[in-house]
Interface confidence: low
Amino acid sequence: VPGEAEQPAPELVEVEVGSTALLKCGLSQSQGNLSHVDWFSVHKEKRTLIFRVRQGQGQSEPGEYEQRLSLQDRGATLALTQVTPQDERIFLCQGKRPRSQEYRIQLRVYKAPEEPNIQVNPLGIPVNSKEPEEVATCVGRNGYPIPQVIWYKNGRPLKEEKNRVHIQSSQTVESSGLYTLQSILKAQLVKEDKDAQFYCELNYRLPSGNHMKESREVTVPVFYPTEKVWLEVEPVGMLKEGDRVEIRCLADGNPPPHFSISKQNPSTREAEEETTNDNGVLVLEPARKEHSGRYECQGLDLDTMISLLSEPQELLVNYVSDVRVSPAAPERQEGSSLTLTCEAESSQDLEFQWLREETGQVLERGPVLQLHDLKREAGGGYRCVASVPSIPGLNRTQLVNVAIFGPPWMAFKERKVWVKENMVLNLSCEASGHPRPTISWNVNGTASEQDQDPQRVLSTLNVLVTPELLETGVECTASNDLGKNTSILFLELVNLTTLTPDSNTTTGLSTSTASPHTRANSTSTERKLPEPESRG
C-alpha cells in the first residue's frame, strides 16, 4: 500500500448549500469491483462508514447521512442531498476486490452571503480625535465559507494604515454552520470627509467562480469646528417695504454653533439681539424701512464657548415715504392758474407722475404740475404717483382735489321722462359747483341727497304721478353762494300710440356726462431729495 504522503490529491467537488453533491467513485475496474464498495466520510482523520454497495445495491449506514444518500449511475456515483456546511469534508470509496483500493473526494461547500448591511456610526466622528474612531459597521449574514470584506471610500479601497485606518473583522458561526461576518471600519477623518461615501464589499466564491456584493453607500456625520459664520438674506436683490425678508445665519462647522442675530442700534451703535423663529431665522414681515441697518450673526460653540462673529451685512429696505402735495386743498377762480407740487422721500431716486384721477390720463412726468386758465371742467381729482423705477411695485400716491369756484352747473338742462299715471316715479338731478351746491325740488316728495365728490351732489326724489304733476312738470334747483341753476324734467304719459322713446329720453336715473379735462402748457422742475444728516 503506498504511503499517505504519496496518495494522489483528492478529486474536488464543489456544491452550493442545499443542493445535491454527486460523489463519483473514480476507481478503475482494475482497482476494484464497483459492485462491492464501501463509502466513508473522513472528519478530523476519523473514518466513518456511511454507505455500502453490494452486488450493485446500496445500503445507508445509520447516522447523520442515513436519509440523504442514494446510488446513481449504475452504482458508480453516490448522491448526497441537502448539502450543509458540515458536509465539507473528504469522502472516500473503497473497493474490496481484487485488492483493497480507495478513491478520495474533497467536498467543498459554498453559500453566498446575504446583501451586506451597513450601519453608520450615528454619533458621528470629531475630526480632532487622537485615534481612529468607528465610522461604520458592515454585516454579511449566512455565507460559507467566510467572505472577505473590502471597505471603500469614494470608490477607492481602504487599506490598513497605522493610526489612520483600522479594519476590525470578526465572525460568528450560526447553528446552520453558516458564517456571519462583522467588520468595523475605524478611521481618523478630516473635514473634507463630511461628504465622503463609504461602502463595504463582500467577496465570496461559488462553484461558478468568484462573486461580490456591495452595500449601499453611506456618509458619516463628521464634526469639525466652525471657522466662519455668515449671514444670508432672502430674497436676493433690492428689497422694498412690504416684502417678506428672511435673514439667516450659516456656519461652516458641524454641528453648527448656537446662532444669534443682532442689529446695530443706529443711535447707540450697540448690537441689539433680534428675536428669531424656532429655526433661528429672523423674519421681517412686512419689511419696513426701520429694518434697514447693519446686521451681524454670532455663532457660539456651546462645547468650547468660543464665539465667532460674522462680517456685518448692511440691509436696505427701500421705501417711499408718504406723498405730500401742496397746496393740499386748492381752490381757484375760473381763468386763474394753479401749481401743484408733489414731494416724497425715498431710499432711491424717485420718479413723479401726475394723473387725472377721473380718466387716468398722464398729465405730467415730474413733481410739479402747472395748470393755466382754469375752466370749470378742470375741477376734480389729480393724483401724484411717486415711484422708484428700479424697484417694480415700490410707489406711493396722493390724491388732491382741485375746486374751481363757480355757481351750480347742472348735468342736464331739461329732460323728458315717460311715465304712467299713479306710478311712483324715481327722479334724479345732479349738479356741481364750488362751494358744493344743495338741490331743492318744486314738488313735494321724498328727496335724498348724496355727495358724489367735494364739488358734486346727486339728489333723488320719489314722487307719485298725478294729473297736476303731469301738467306742471318737475324742476330741481341747485344753489350755492355764487348763484343758482335749474333743470326741468318734462313728464309724458305712455300710451299705446307712443313710440319707443328715442335715445334722448330716459325713464330712470339721469347721469352726468363726462367732461373734457384740459390743461394748459406745464413745466416741471427738478427736485433733489434732502441729504441725511451726518453723524456727530
Epitope: 443706529p266 443711535s267 447707540t268 451703535r269 450697540e270 441725511p532 444728516e533 451726518s534 453723524r535 456727530g536
Partner: antibody, heavy 117, light 107 residues
Framework: QVQLQESGPGLVKPSQTLSLTCTVS??????????WSWIRQHPGKGLEWIGY???????YYNPSLKSRVTISVDTSKNQFSLKLSSVTAADTAVYYC?????????WGQGTLVTVSS | EIVMTQSPATLSVSPGERATLSCRAS??????LAWYQQKPGQAPRLLIY???TRATGIPARFSGSGSGTEFTLTISSLQSEDFAVYYC?????????FGQGTKVEIK
C-alpha cells in the same frame, strides 16, 4: 450749529424730585442718527453719565441711578427732560445735556442744581 | 460696567513740551473711545473720537492712539490754553463711563 440749553430750578429740597429740561436748537431731535443724554459732574469731581433717550422714546439709564431716573422726549417742542426723584445732598451737581453719537460733540453749558433744605 | 482709569492724576508740564496722558479700560472697548478737555466753569469739549480721529476744529497738536484697553492722548507742544482737565470716555457699552480725569498744570 446745534445748541443745547438746560433749564430748571437751581435749588431742590431733599426727598423731592429734580426736574430739568434741555431745549435743542439748530437741529431736529427727531434725527435718528443721535441719542440725547444727561451727564452730571459733582463739584470738583469727574463726569457721571445719567442716561439717554432716543427720539422714538427708547431709553437707557445708568444702573446706579435707574430706580430714580426718568428721561422723556417731546419732539414737537424739540426738547428732552430729566426727572430725578428722592434727591439727597449727594445729587448736588452741575447737570449737562448732550447730543451723543461717536462721543458727545455738543453739550449744554450746564446748570448747577443744589439739594438743600 | 466698564471702568476707565486715567494716569497720572496730575501732569506738570512746561509750555512747549510734550504731554502724554494714558487711559485704560477694564475690558476691551475696541476703538470706541473719546477724549475731552474741560476748563473751569465750562462744559467738556470733544477733542478725539474713534480713539484717534480729531473732532472738527481741534488743532493738529492733539492726537490719540490705542485700541482695545490701552489708549493715549498726546499733546505734542503744550500751549498756554491747553492747561485743563482731560477725560477719556468709552462708548462701546452702556452705561457710558468716563475716566476720573488727568489735570495738566503748568510746571
Amino acid at each position: 450749529q446745534v445748541q443745547l440749553q438746560e433749564s430748571g430750578p437751581g435749588l431742590v429740597k431733599p426727598s423731592q424730585t429734580l426736574s430739568l429740561t434741555c431745549t435743542v436748537s439748530g437741529g431736529s431731535i427727531s434725527s435718528g442718527t443721535y441719542h440725547w443724554s444727561w451727564i452730571r459732574q459733582h463739584p470738583g469731581k469727574g463726569l457721571e453719565w445719567i442716561g439717554y433717550i432716543y427720539y422714538s422714546g427708547s431709553t437707557y439709564y445708568n444702573p446706579s441711578l435707574k430706580s430714580r431716573v426718568t428721561i422723556s422726549v417731546d419732539t414737537s417742542k424739540n426738547q428732552f427732560s430729566l426727572k430725578l426723584s428722592s434727591v439727597t445732598a449727594a445729587d448736588t451737581a452741575v447737570y449737562y445735556c448732550a447730543r451723543g453719537g461717536d462721543g458727545y460733540k455738543y453739550w449744554g453749558q450746564g446748570t448747577l442744581v443744589t439739594v438743600s433744605s | 460696567e466698564i471702568v476707565m482709569t486715567q494716569s497720572p492724576a496730575t501732569l506738570s508740564v512746561s509750555p512747549g513740551e510734550r504731554a502724554t496722558l494714558s487711559c485704560r479700560a477694564s475690558q476691551s472697548v475696541s476703538n470706541n473711545l473719546a477724549w475731552y478737555q474741560q476748563k473751569p466753569g465750562q462744559a467738556p469739549r470733544l477733542l478725539i473720537y474713534g480713539a484717534s480721529t480729531r473732532a472738527t476744529g481741534i488743532p493738529a497738536r492733539f492726537s490719540g492712539s490705542g485700541s482695545g484697553t490701552e489708549f493715549t492722548l498726546t499733546i505734542s507742544s503744550l500751549q498756554s490754553e491747553d492747561f485743563a482737565v482731560y477725560y477719556c470716555q468709552q462708548y462701546n457699552n452702556w452705561p457710558r463711563t468716563f475716566g476720573q480725569g488727568t489735570k495738566v498744570e503748568i510746571k
